[in-house]
Amino acid sequence: QDCSAQCQCAAEAAPHCPAGVSLVLDGCGCCRVCAKQLGELCTERDPCDPHKGLFCDFGSPANRKIGVCTAKDGAPCVFGGSVYRSGESFQSSCKYQCTCLDGAVGCVPLCSMDVRLPSPDCPFPRRVKLPGKCCEEWVCDEPKDRTAVGPALAAYRLEDTFGPDPTMMRANCLVQTTEWSACSKTCGMGISTRVTNDNTFCRLEKQSRLCMVRPCEADLEENIKKGKKCIRTPKIAKPVKFELSGCTSVKTYRAKFCGVCTDGRCCTPHRTTTLPVEFKCPDGEIMKKNMMFIKTCACHYNCPGDNDIFESLYYRKMYGDMA
């Protein structure tokens, strides 16, 4: 390729590349161009995406004009039940563009993560999911005395309106977090979840933690004292190590568990806290997981029915969680 001529670029400004496509210098080191992707035609002037391990395969050494972007040998990826070649890009959903690179999947958001600050034209901006739209969009809650096209001439006083509690706002985000759900298992290791937007971009996210209401192997009914029908929080004689998928907690824990009743009532966690627990796996890998620790249990008749899809609210929620 002859690069002796003076650099001449198609546009003054660098082009805007689609999400997940790298902006690279052309073969002459002159102009910034959008890199060609896996399977696309390439030339020395239009290079392949180096960040995805792609190279321009010209086939025979004699042909140095046009090639095809090919992946350097790398491990494929399994994602959402599909197999992708190394260097291959795909849309995991309407919100994310992903790329497989040597066994690892990296994704970039297709939806704007923009933040909107209040202004006279939009005093209470909110992000909402609109029907038929993939990405959330900004909407402005209009005060009653606004004109059809812009701010009203009469000074509209923000302090005279009722909005969200300003102490709960973080950079225009009304922080909301649901209660933790009930543990997915009545005995043994399960999962408890909640939804929150308590993060940098005020985005709803699902959080999960491990939970164990009681060990499965414990025969707790034996410990119920004569004349009593329940054992709410049985004493666990010795500290325990938790197990998760063949991995064992590094530390031992004197954890509280919930007991059982003989009169049809069930005992579930009432007040809980969340703490990180480190697990060591046979291959030496250490993984850290958040786990529920029980402070108090409650015994009640609001037990989940076998076919009841609307499990009782009491059973579904964890109250008074500290974290």
Epitope: S112, P120, D121, G150, P151, L158
Partner: antibody, heavy 114, light 110 residues
Framework: EVTLKESGPVLVKPTETLTLTCTVS????????VHWIRQPPGKALEWLAV???????DYNAAFMSRLTISKDTSKSQVVLTMTNMDPVDTATYYC????????WGQGTTVTVSS | ETVVTQEPSLTVSPGGTVTLTCRSS?????????ANWVQQKPGQAFRGLIG???NRAPWTPARFSGSLLGGKAALTLSGVQPEDEAEYYC?????????FGGGTKLTVLG
């Protein structure tokens, strides 16, 4: 990525009309308004006009008779015209997004001289 | 004509706290003035730091806070860093138009 870019003539003659274009990307003009602001050499910022997300407009009273702001949402462009230019209008002209003036263009320098 | 006044210049030591203010010539600044604070570092573009009196932009560090103090809009920098040296402008909304202040040149000693 949110960007705003001003374009227009570098030099205009006194009494001529200045037309500046602000081309935006990364957001929609139906969702955010756009402001025009200028800064004469060595001086402070001076707010000129705004076109709101729903098409309404507001102007600096000192320039109201000379300014017109409009937008083409489909082209993601906001246009400001300023008539009867004078050497005192020599300045760097900026467009900025509504909502805390969070994003600004790099500015375009306009010199008014015969 | 409404005038918005800022301190022309302020000097602060690294790690110190400084408050920039924005005064309106026609009375106390309120939340309906939607006070905005804009920063320009030498050789860089302008960017908004605070909007609607006290709301930080996503890139604005937590050491910057906007508020109303004694009838004025205020921008407080706590634990000032050398990179905070810049020109700061406030802008106030008056029902039909914005007015920018004259700007404050913040110098960080060091």
């Amino acid at each position: 990525e949110v960007t705003l870019k001003e374009s227009g003539p570098v030099l205009v003659k006194p009494t001529e009309t200045l037309t500046l274009t602000c081309t935006v990307s990364g957001f929609s003009l139906s969702t955010f308004g756009v402001h025009w602001i200028r800064q004469p050499p060595g001086k402070a910022l001076e707010w000129l006009a705004v076109i709101w997300r729903r098409g309404g407009t507001d102007y600096n009273a000192a320039f109201m008779s000379r300014l017109t702001i409009s937008k083409d949402t489909s082209k993601s462009q906001v246009v400001l015209t300023m008539t009867n230019m004078d050497p005192v209008d020599t300045a760097t002209y900026y467009c900025a997004r509504d909502g805390g003036f969070d994003y600004w263009g790099q500015g375009t320098t306009v010199t008014v001289s015969s | 004509e409404t005038v918005v006044t800022q301190e022309p210049s302020l000097t602060v030591s690294p790690g110190g706290t400084v408050t920039l203010t924005c005064r309106s010539s026609i009375g106390a600044v309120t939340t309906s003035n939607y006070a905005n604070w804009v920063q320009q570092k030498p050789g860089q573009a302008f960017r908004g730091l605070i909007g609607g009196t006290s709301n930080r932009a996503p890139w604005t560090p937590a050491r910057f806070s906007g508020s109303l103090l004694g009838g004025k809009a205020a921008l407080t920098l706590s634990g000032v860093q050398p990179e905070d040296e810049a020109e700061y402008y406030c802008a106030l909304w008056y029902s039909t138009h914005y007015v920018f202040g004259g700007g404050t040149k913040l110098t960080v000693l060091g």
